[in-house]
Amino acid sequence: MAVTACQGLGFVVSLIGIAGIIAATCMDQWSTQDLYNNPVTAVFNYQGLWRSCVRESSGFTECRGYFTLLGLPAMLQAVRALMIVGIVLGAIGLLVSIFALKCIRIGSMEDSAKANMTLTSGIMFIVSGLCAIAGVSVFANMLVTNFWMSTANMYTGMGGMVQTVQTRYTFGAALFVGWVAGGLTLIGGVMMCIACRGLAPEETNYKAVSYHASGHSVAYKPGGFKASTGFGSNTKNKKIYDGGARTEDEVQSYPSKHDYV
């Protein structure tokens, strides 16, 4: 029950995280104009990974896409790549984890297969989350660097008479969405990996084997234990280890070191 809950919760958390990563990637507010000097501005600039926008105080908003690929900064391209890789891995992870969910039965899929799929999706979520966090952090670092550079060159005077105020950019809402979403995806991935441990059989699975001669065979148990015949009509697998709430068909019998044939 705990394994199912952990797996289910991991899936839901990852789903929310990946939705957040997609939202952050699409958002226009990766960087927003710093309003420290002028809290009420007549022209407000903000930029995303795919376009830059200007919102006038009149309410008019104009957005322009970055229609060049080669002219864009390498860092921006890297951030785009990291976010897309994060989304792709996350999407594949979600697809895999749906089939791995313990509450969903698909044919005669064994627990070991489900465990492997859960682990795979968990690793994918972890990498997806790390990609998103890395992408957002690279962009944030780029902003911080540019912010202090533009602060140093804030006013460039023309003969000391005319001031040209350089637009400074600070963290936009998308960065926080990205960080949180990446974190959630990471947590979801870890939860899936933990769930995988509970799904996988912890012991080596041996099949119980009985040997018999052509005649009437008797298996002798040392230590004065009662002998039992090998292939009796009423022979059943006995529940010798209860590792938790398991159904009868999930239970394996293990040979004792004292069993001789």
Partner: antibody
Framework: QVQLQQSGAELVRPGTSVKVSCKAS????????IEWIKQRPGQGLEWIGV????????NYNEKLKGKATLTADKSSSTAYMQLSSLTSGDSAVYFC???????????WGQGTSVTVSS | DIVMTQSPSSLTVTAGEKVTLSCKSS????????????LTWYQQKPGQPPKLLIY???TRESGVPDRFTGSGSGTDFTLTISSVQAEDLAIYYC?????????FGAGTKLELT
């Protein structure tokens, strides 16, 4: 067609207050901001402030803060400007105008003359 | 506050003449985000409210005759009337539309001989 109809001329005593109205018609009132501009006789234009009729949000010229209070009534599509503690320096023609892209003013009211005299 | 300086304060011209009005701002009105200059030109005739002529420094408002042309970038702007008509007798104001408070120039009075 778009129209901004302002209230009539006012003659008021110093120290009192006056409320100038600006009724909008021919467009969605809440979709555009309304600006108020002051023009003293024979002088240039001075920006007073702006109001968002949809949200009621305002932004004032710091130099005139406390002098003017901007409000808007969505139901009657009317913007108001209340001028308080009037002095002779407040005698002017006051215009309301619609604020559009480019942060420009495309339609203006005819102006309301406010004369402060004892 | 951004200070807008217009020159000349008044100008006497003859009909058909080409006129150039100047406007300078104390700070750049150029916005890098959309590569636009936030300067607006208005025309005010006696006894009337101002009329919008040009916004974004060079975009002509619909219905404005094409003899009116706005140009310039950063801090220096001009309004050019290619062939002055009698109905162009008015005061022309430039306005900073970039930063609050939205300041106006003192105006240039255009008179006909």
């Amino acid at each position: 067609q778009v129209q901004l109809q302002q209230s009539g001329a006012e003659l008021v005593r110093p120290g009192t207050s006056v409320k100038v109205s600006c009724k909008a018609s021919g467009y969605a009132f809440t979709n555009y901001l309304i600006e108020w501009i002051k023009q003293r006789p024979g002088q240039g234009l001075e920006w007073i402030g702006v109001i968002n009729p949809g949200s009621g949000g305002t932004n004032y010229n710091e130099k005139l803060k406390g002098k003017a209070t901007l409000t808007a009534d969505k139901s009657s599509s009317t913007a108001y400007m209340q001028l308080s503690s009037l002095t002779s320096g407040d005698s002017a023609v006051y215009f309301c105008a619609r604020y559009v892209k480019g942060n420009a003013l495309d339609y203006w009211g005819q102006g309301t003359s406010v004369t402060v005299s004892s | 506050d951004i200070v807008m300086t217009q020159s000349p304060s008044s100008l006497t011209v003859t009909a058909g003449e080409k006129v150039t009005l100047s406007c300078k701002s104390s700070q750049s009105l150029f916005n890098s985000g959309n590569q636009k200059n936030y300067l607006t030109w208005y025309q005010q005739k006696p006894g009337q409210p101002p009329k919008l002529l040009i916004y974004w420094a060079s975009t002509r408002e619909s219905g404005v005759p094409d003899r009116f042309t706005g140009s310039g970038s950063g801090t220096d702007f001009t309004l050019t009337i290619s062939s002055v008509q009698a109905e162009d007798l008015a005061i022309y104001y430039c306005q900073n539309s970039y930063s609050f408070p939205l300041t106006f120039g003192a105006g240039t009075k255009l008179e006909l001989t």
